[in-house]
Interface confidence: low
């Protein structure tokens, strides 16, 4: 007699380890013999899928090698055309020993920064992650924490954090260890003992002392007035990550001697500098507020504007003065492409002479600022329209960068050529050609042949600007 299908052994939850075999049994009584189909998460399992074996007229479903993605609800459905189809469902829970999917890697980090050693794991039940430093379990503290992901985060890395680390992933099925990795803590170069300034008699010997530390141990170089030391002897010793350098000099002229300690962090360098002056008794007194050196201009942007082989002031508040000042000019120069033909050469002359100021190479190299009258000539005569537009943009916050402000002088703060003609630099490009007041003669020397006629003084200025904006 025909009999509707009945499932005599309902499906149950099956636990299986990754790469092991898992079997679901769906025993059915019926007549005629039923057709049995299987689904996973409501998607039909195809009979020809080689990852599965379906036997006993469809009553046995075997997963031949369980993967972690096989998790889900499996159902068998039996139908023989008599009565309705019947269904039974059960879950497959894939159990997995811990596995480290993203192991930690060697890390070099600069002291004070944040270090993260990755350790991403897989496993069911979810593994717990701990860390070992050296031979001991790592204890979490205010700076050290194991994140939800298993990664180790160390805030404000200190020298003592350096060492060998490994992560450990553990669940009820087993334990996995990562390979040992190294955390190296690097420390910026720092000068421990700066060279001292000396005032000596002509022809004496002086020893300048400079001590520095860092990880890796820095190298020390000595600079004399902006150039590599050409004479004198240097003795160095290294002990306990401290380098000690002594420069012995025979003094025949005053100079500014800079000790530069440099160490390398990946592709970047860290540099610490300390300077000392060696003056000769009865030579002129050094000025103390200028930090820089005189050097021939060797850039490109201002080649046509500055005098050939001009001696310019390079500001050592930049790590790389020559490049920093050149890039500063370059950035501002690009903005000058759009200004009027009258303004452009004047603005270029002002820009180059402001960023690369003429340098007086005394005991302490001194920059010579542009004369106020020339600055005002650019501002109020040649580039009045553009200057106003720039101030307006600054006022309305349209400039995203402060960089252009560095390349625009404050005219009112510059010395007047009427106070002391030698205390400020003139801009030859701005000196009028009497036949044609709008031309800029080619530069033949750094001194103008004609004084600028009727230059507006700051008092007769056609407009003024609040000092809040450093454009005046």
């Amino acid at each position: 007699l025909p009999k509707a299908p009945v499932i005599t052994t309902p499906l149950e939850t099956v636990d299986a380890l990754v790469e092991e075999v898992a079997t679901f049994m769906c025993a059915v009584e019926s007549y005629p013999q039923p057709e049995i189909s299987w689904t996973r998460n409501k998607i039909l399992i195809k009979l020809f899928d080689t990852r599965y074996s379906i036997r006993e007229n469809g009553q046995l479903l075997t997963i031949l090698s369980v993967e972690d993605s096989d998790d889900g609800i499996y159902c068998c459905t039996a139908n023989n055309g008599v009565g309705g189809a019947v269904e039974s469902c059960g879950a497959l829970q894939v159990k997995m020993k811990p596995k480290i999917t993203r192991p930690p890697i060697n890390v070099k980090i600069i002291e004070g920064l944040k270090a993260v050693l990755p350790c991403t794991t897989m496993g069911n039940p979810k593994p717990s992650v701990s860390w070992i430093k050296g031979d001991s379990p790592l204890r979490e503290n205010s700076r050290t924490a194991v994140l939800e992901s298993g990664s180790l985060r160390i805030h404000n890395v200190q020298k003592e954090d350096a060492g060998q680390y490994r992560c450990v992933a553990k669940n009820s099925l087993g334990t996995a260890y990562s390979k040992v990795v190294k955390l190296e803590v690097e420390v910026f170069a720092r000068i421990l003992r700066a060279p001292e300034s000396h005032n000596v008699t002509f022809g004496s010997f002086v020893t300048l002392h400079c001590t520095a530390t860092g990880i890796p141990v820095p190298t020390i170089t000595w600079i004399e007035n902006g150039n590599a030391v050409s004479s004198g002897s240097i003795q160095e010793s290294v002990k306990d990550r401290v380098i000690d350098s002594r420069l012995q000099l025979f003094i025949t002229k005053p100079g500014l001697y800079t000790c530069i300690a440099t160490n390398k962090h990946g592709e970047k360098f860290s540099t610490a500098k300390a300077a000392a002056t060696v003056s000769i008794a009865e030579w002129s007194k050094p000025q103390k507020d200028n930090k820089g050196y005189c050097a021939q201009y060797r850039g490109e942007v201002c080649n046509a504007v500055l005098a050939k082989d001009a001696l310019v002031f390079l500001n050592t508040s930049y790590a790389d003065p020559e490049e920093a000042q050149e890039l500063l000019v370059h950035t501002a120069w690009n903005e000058l492409k759009v200004v009027s033909p009258l303004c452009r050469p004047a603005a270029e002359a002002l820009l180059c002479n402001h960023v690369f100021q003429e340098c007086s190479p005394g005991v302490v190299p001194t920059p010579i600022p542009i004369c106020r009258e020339y600055c005002l000539a650019v501002k109020e005569l040649f580039c009045a329209k553009e200057w106003l537009a720039m101030e307006e943009k600054t006022h309305r916050g349209l400039y995203r960068s402060e960089m252009h402000l560095l390349s625009v002088p404050e005219c009112s703060k510059l010395p007047s050529m009427h106070w002391d003609p030698t205390a400020c630099a003139r801009l030859p490009h701005l000196d009028y050609n009497k036949e044609n007041p709008k031309t800029f003669p080619p530069m033949t020397s750094s001194k103008p042949s004609v004084d600028i006629p009727n230059l507006p003084s700051s008092s007769s200025s056609s407009f003024s600007v609040s000092p809040t904006y450093s454009m005046t």
Epitope: E267, F269, R298, E300, V301, N303, D320, E322, E323, H330
Partner: antibody
Amino acid sequence: ELQLVESGGGLVQPGGSLRLSCAASGFTFDDYGMSWVRQAPGKGLEWVSAIPWNGGSTYYKESVKGRFTISRDNAKKTLYLQMNSLKSEDTAVYYCAKRSGRIAFGALDAWGQGTLVTVSS
Amino acid sequence: QAVVTQEPSLSVSPGGTVTLTCGLSSGSVTSSNYPDWYQQTPGQAPRTLIYTTNSRHSGVPSRFSGSISGNKAALTITGAQPEDEADYYCALYMGGGSNVYVFGGGTKLTVL
């Protein structure tokens, strides 16, 4: 006489590494920026990387960023190019070139004879 | 990203004048791109001819000159010689970031 002599080229498999060196003589090495320029067989020149006089900053062509590292040892008067994760398209003659000033982007005013790098399996 | 464009090939008669140009796929070449020109003969390393638009490198004959004309950089050879037959490359400074310095594809110059 100013001379730039490259070395370190050769045959390497894809994914491999090479370190090129450029020994400089006849000029004050630490006064000038330096560059690497390459030329694939039968193709044009291609700027690869640059470094200023003091190694304080580095510049790279986009396609080599993260794989190539330029460095210099001023005491040894040597420029280096460490090339990792090499690809077949990195096959080229690599020229070391001197810049006209300290900055990294000055004109190239002196060239070495080049060293051939072949990346092939 | 801007591409530096050059004529693939040009020819000139001995003693004649020829101008090679160097442009940008997007925009104009200006003095702020500091155009440089290099010459390369087969099997040889490149040689610097002109740097920063119009400065002749030492030892370069005066028949080579550089300029910016319209929206392109130009290399002019006045009174071409047979030994001027070579590949000529221009290179432009493109500002900060990546690909700071970009070469053109080169111009093959034939002196017929």
